[in-house]
């Protein structure tokens, strides 16, 4: 049977301490590099093994990062976002959005917030 994908969207504040090799993740997105259709937000594309983010355990691939140390990541060029992380200091506070797949049901309207297109 065909199904619908629904998502539970939650937000979380994650405080990371920069490790010897940095924060330990990769990002995609930005106004000049839209990774998700009609969304220029910044997304986590890779968590580095044994890096600060991996050891903390809360940040996940696919998470959208909304802010860094209280600074909004909306409408930033990709490289400007990269530079913001690199200059964020030793203690880094991330506001992130997790999207969790919660169920498969009968076919219907696309789940709210589904970025697929």
């Amino acid at each position: 049977m065909n199904g619908r994908v629904d998502y539970l969207v939650t937000e979380e504040e994650i405080n990371l301490t920069r490790g010897p090799s940095g924060l330990g993740f990769n990002i995609v997105g930005g106004t000049d590099q839209q990774y998700v259709s009609n969304d220029s937000g910044i997304y986590v594309s890779r968590i580095k093994e044994n890096g600060a983010a991996a050891l903390d355990g809360r940040l996940q691939e696919g998470d959208k990062i909304l802010s860094v140390n209280g600074q909004d990541l909306k409408n930033l060029l990709h490289q400007d976002a990269v530079d913001l992380f690199r200059n964020a200091g030793y203690a880094v506070s991330l506001r992130v959005q997790h999207r969790l797949q919660v169920q498969n049901g009968p076919i219907g309207h696309r789940g709210e917030g589904d970025p697929s297109g």
Epitope: L23, F25, N26, Q33, K48, H78, Q79, V82
Partner: nanobody, 125 residues
């Protein structure tokens, strides 16, 4: 997963040129950081060049002789190798990772890359 296929290797005289190509699968190729590494017999794999959203990076040993470029429409990254030397003889590997690292060190660490090609042999005599 991302598949990488290299081509363009071969044998050339010292001072000659070759162009390597690496074609990747995936619909978001423009977001990938792409790199070339090489491994000579009995030696460790070493960084050659990389290209990310922010620009290109080169090992000191190839700066001024090699040029990395990409064609996002063709999902392909190139390594133009000029003024080749016998010490450039190696198997050349293409590598990829999705996105840009937020960390400030360079892209020369093989552990930075999740996807690897099978390699193409370059021999300079």
């Amino acid at each position: 997963d991302v598949q990488l296929v290299e081509s363009g290797g071969g044998s050339v005289q010292a001072g000659g040129s070759l162009r390597l190509s690496c074609t990747a699968s995936g619909r978001t190729f423009s977001t990938y950081t792409m790199a070339w590494f090489r491994q000579a017999p009995g030696k460790e794999r070493e960084f050659v060049a990389a290209i990310s959203w922010s620009g290109a990076y080169y090992a000191d040993s190839v700066t001024g002789r090699f040029t990395i470029s990409r064609d996002n429409a063709k999902n392909t990254v190139y390594l133009q190798m000029n003024s080749l030397k016998p010490e450039d003889t190696a198997v050349y590997y293409c590598a990829a990772v999705i996105g840009s690292t937020v960390d400030s060190y360079g892209p020369g660490d093989p552990l930075e890359y999740d996807y690897w090609g099978q390699g193409t042999q370059v021999t300079v005599s």
